[in-house]
Each structure stands twice: as C-alpha cells, then as structure tokens.
C-alpha cells in the first residue's frame, strides 16, 4: 500500500509462492533454499523466481517445486510468534543477474534504518487490488518502544515494526513471507498487522536475526552432504 512498481528484476531475491495462484512472497537465501513466513505454510508449493509480472511469462522466470517445507518448531498460529518457514527447492536455482540470493543479517535491525519491502500483495487499505507487477516500498525500521506501543502485549522479541505511524504506507495481504532488506541483508519477513496502512498500526515483521542459527542448522540437517565425525 502506498508503494511503487519496482524496477524490473531489481529485487532478484524476491520469490512468489504459488499454489495455482500467488499466495505469499519469499526470499532466496541460497541456490536451493527460500525463507518465508510460517503462516504461509502449505503442503504443496511451487516457488517462482525471477518474476516481475506474475500474470505474464516474461522470459526470466524459474518455476521450481518445493522439495521440503519446514516451519519453525515453535511457530504459534495464534500469536504469530516464530513466523518463519524454510523451503528447500527440488533443484537448485540458476543464479544470474535476475535471480540471486540475499544475505542473512549480521546484526539485529536498528531503529531508523531504511529498508526495502516488496511483494505482490494488496495495494489498498480499504478494499482489495492485487497487482500483477512487483511493488516496492521504502520504509524505516521503528523502535521497539514504538512497536510495542502500537500493539500492546502482542510484540515478542522475535518481531519488529517497519513503516509509518501516520499510516498510508505498509505491506498487506499477499505480501507475507516477503523480504525486508536493509543494507543488503534480509532483516525481516512480512508477517502481520491490524489491517494495512492504518494510523498507529505499522507492519509487524519476523526478526530474521534471531533465526540465523536455526536457518543454518536446518539447512545443514537437510543437506545431502552430511559430514559425520
């Protein structure tokens, strides 16, 4: 909501999760792994990479089925705590200028840092309009105090807020699982909010920094190349 059409393939780590239709976003973090939101879980997912217009075959797409879909063991569907999911692709993505991985964070998100949020979610706060072309939004990371004040009692240490307390610009339905990137690192995963782009109701995002070890351990445990000592 309140964003702009991204330059074509300017978000090369952005993926679309498809089950006959786009239902969530995700981020490519290695040639064979995608991270998304826990509440995007489905038993069958096709991962679509290199997309810009999801309704048109433009020639840069790679469609790869999910081989493994692993939700965080402590995911809570009621509170959306630990809202993170890993998808192993059935075959590695071909990395090129339009499809490439995003780095995991080396430090937690800092208040005031500019970030890029992207997705094919709803662009209306009152109503629904699902775009064909990838939308981008530049938004600041909010302080944990502002975040907790916006959603008293609902924000865990695994969540943070990004956006504008005045409303008007936000992620929305269909954006879940998609990236929040600051300084070339995947800091957040689109998770939840009260409505979209409402005043004093900024978007809430999964804090990827808290899951770097889980991500690395899960990838290692699900690799065909285990090294037993």
């Amino acid at each position: 909501v309140g964003g702009y059409i991204c330059e074509e393939n300017s978000v090369p780590y952005q993926v679309s999760l498809n089950s006959g239709y786009h239902f969530c976003g995700g981020s490519l973090i290695s040639e064979q792994w995608v991270v998304s939101a826990g509440h995007c879980y489905k038993s069958r997912i096709q991962v679509r990479l290199g997309e810009h217009n999801i309704e048109v075959l433009e020639g840069n797409e790679q469609f790869i089925n999910a081989a493994k879909i692993i939700r965080h063991p402590k995911y809570n569907s009621r509170t959306l705590d630990n809202d993170i999911l890993l998808i192993k692709l059935s075959s590695p993505a071909v990395i090129n200028s339009r499809v490439s991985a995003i780095s995991l964070p080396t430090a937690p998100p800092a208040a005031g840092t500019e970030s890029l949020i992207s997705g094919w979610g709803n662009t209306l706060s009152s109503g629904a309009d699902y775009p064909d072309e990838l939308q981008c939004l530049d938004a600041p990371v909010l302080s944990q105090a502002e975040c907790e004040a916006s959603y008293p009692g609902k924000i865990t240490n695994n969540m943070f807020c990004v956006g504008f307390l005045e409303g008007g610009k936000d992620s929305c339905q269909g954006d879940a699982g998609g990236p929040v990137v600051s300084n070339g690192e995947l800091q957040g995963i689109v998770s939840w909010g009260y409505g979209c782009a409402q005043k004093n109701r900024p978007g809430v995002y999964t804090k990827v920094y808290n899951y770097v070890d889980w991500i690395k351990d899960t990838i290692a445990a699900n690799s065909h190349h285990h090294h037993h000592h």
Epitope: S126, A128, Q173, A176, S191, G193, Q198, G203
Partner: antibody, heavy 127, light 108 residues
Framework: QVQLVQSGAEVKKPGASVKVSCKAS????????MHWVRQAPGQGLEWMGA????????AYAQKFQGRVTMTRDTSISTAYMELSRLRSDDTAVYYC????????????????????WGQGTMVTVSS | EIVMTQSPATLSVSPGERATLSCRAS??????LAWYQQKPGQAPRLLIY???TRATGIPARFSGSGSGTEFTLTISSLQSEDFAVYYC??????????FGGGTKVEIK
C-alpha cells in the same frame, strides 16, 4: 451466537433519506469489516460499500458515491447505512454482511467471504 | 471492474441428480471466489469460500473448484432443500465487489 440484527422495514417518499442499522453480537465488532448489499425485487445482489469498524474507513460503489454514508458506533456494536435522495428504484431489501476472518491476521493472501448476514431491511420508496 | 458471469441462468434438475453451475470472471480473481445460496424471502447463505473450501455446516454434497477466471459449483445429489438461487462473488479486487447474476436451480 454470532448474529447481525437489522432495523425494521421503512417506507419513504422520493427525495427523502433512510438510515438502516445493523447490530452485531457474539463477536468483537471491530475485528471484521461490515459490508452492505441490496437486492431489488426479483433481482440479483448489488454491493453498495463497506466500513472498517475499527478505523471507520469506508469504500463505496461508484454508483452510490455521494448518496450513501456508512458509519458505526463501536460502543453499541452497530453499523449504519444511510442512503439519501431516494428514488423509486431504490426500493429493495438492504442487507448488512460481515466478512469472515478477523482483522488481526497474517499477511498471506486470504480468501474472503460474507459468513454472516443480517435478516434484511425492506425499504420501499413510493410517492 | 471485474464482471462475474454465471451460467446457465436457470438449471432444471431432478432430485438426486448432479447439478453443475458455472461462474466466469472477466479477469483473474485468484482463489478469492465465494458461492452463496439464497431461498425466497431469506438472506443469502455462504456455501463456499476460497473457491473450494466449504463453509461451516455446509453438507459435503456441495463442492467448489477452479481458480483464476473459471469456477464451478457442483451439487453431487440434489436434495429438495437445494432448489434455490446460487450466486458467485469475487473478493479479489474491490471496490466494487461484484456478484454474478445468479443461477436458479429448479425442479425438473
């Protein structure tokens, strides 16, 4: 149980206004969008607009823009639809309908629908 | 505006037979399509949402399928209480939120 109870039938003169109420019970009123749909005698369903009971934000069908006003009173869990400058072709049954799925949801693409409807309010416009 | 077109306008079926109702959208609505049943003098009742998910309390003889622009409501074995008007509705792009014109299922 979850229900929507609408105000009673109205008979109005052309040019007048009508205000229909829809009282919600059995759920958190501010968690669900409320829509208004009308049905002229022997005709299909026609969407008029919607209100977000939490923020008061509205969205109206272009056809009714400038003639319809949707409001809510959260203290009594009631939504209102006022239609002004009534004409004879506004004669219809007016329904309020709740959208299933609470407002505080994850941001996955979610299918929506009207899971609960009011009983309808017949509005007759006649000189 | 997304235009929803239902066919046929009237469907004559004998009790116990299968009924297949069609709904076409003028552009893709993903899976955001609902089906309602309406009987004379009553408010509509939700049958199917998300194109294929049965609403609470709806019998298994009602099923929905399709995505994008083509959708189908199937009633596997018509009961006497199923004779009614059926409407499809898209929730993918609004305002305006749009309904199909309805299909009347009548006794043959």
């Amino acid at each position: 149980q979850v229900q929507l109870v609408q105000s009673g039938a109205e008979v109005k003169k052309p040019g007048a206004s009508v205000k229909v109420s829809c009282k919600a019970s059995g759920y958190t009123f501010t968690d669900h969008y409320m829509h208004w749909v009308r049905q002229a005698p022997g005709q299909g369903l026609e969407w008029m607009g919607a209100i977000n009971p939490s923020s008061g934000g509205t969205a109206y069908a272009q056809k009714f823009q400038g003639r319809v006003t949707m409001t809510r009173d959260t203290s009594i869990s009631t939504a209102y639809m006022e239609l002004s400058r009534l004409r004879s072709d506004d004669t219809a049954v007016y329904y309020c309908a709740r959208v299933g799925g609470a407002a505080r949801v994850g941001k996955a693409y979610t299918a929506s629908a009207f899971d609960i409807w009011g009983q309808g309010t017949m509005v007759t416009v006649s000189s | 505006e997304i235009v929803m077109t239902q066919s046929p306008a009237t469907l004559s079926v004998s009790p116990g037979e299968r009924a297949t109702l069609s709904c076409r959208a003028s552009q893709s609505v993903g899976s955001n399509l609902a089906w309602y049943q309406q009987k004379p003098g009553q408010a509509p009742r939700l049958l199917i949402y998300g194109a294929s998910t049965r609403a609470t309390g709806i019998p298994a003889r009602f099923s929905g399928s399709g995505s994008g622009t083509e959708f189908t409501l199937t009633i596997s074995s018509l009961q006497s209480e199923d004779f009614a008007v059926y409407y499809c509705q898209q929730f993918h792009n609004w305002p305006p939120l749009t309904f199909g014109g309805g299909t009347k299922v009548e006794i043959k």
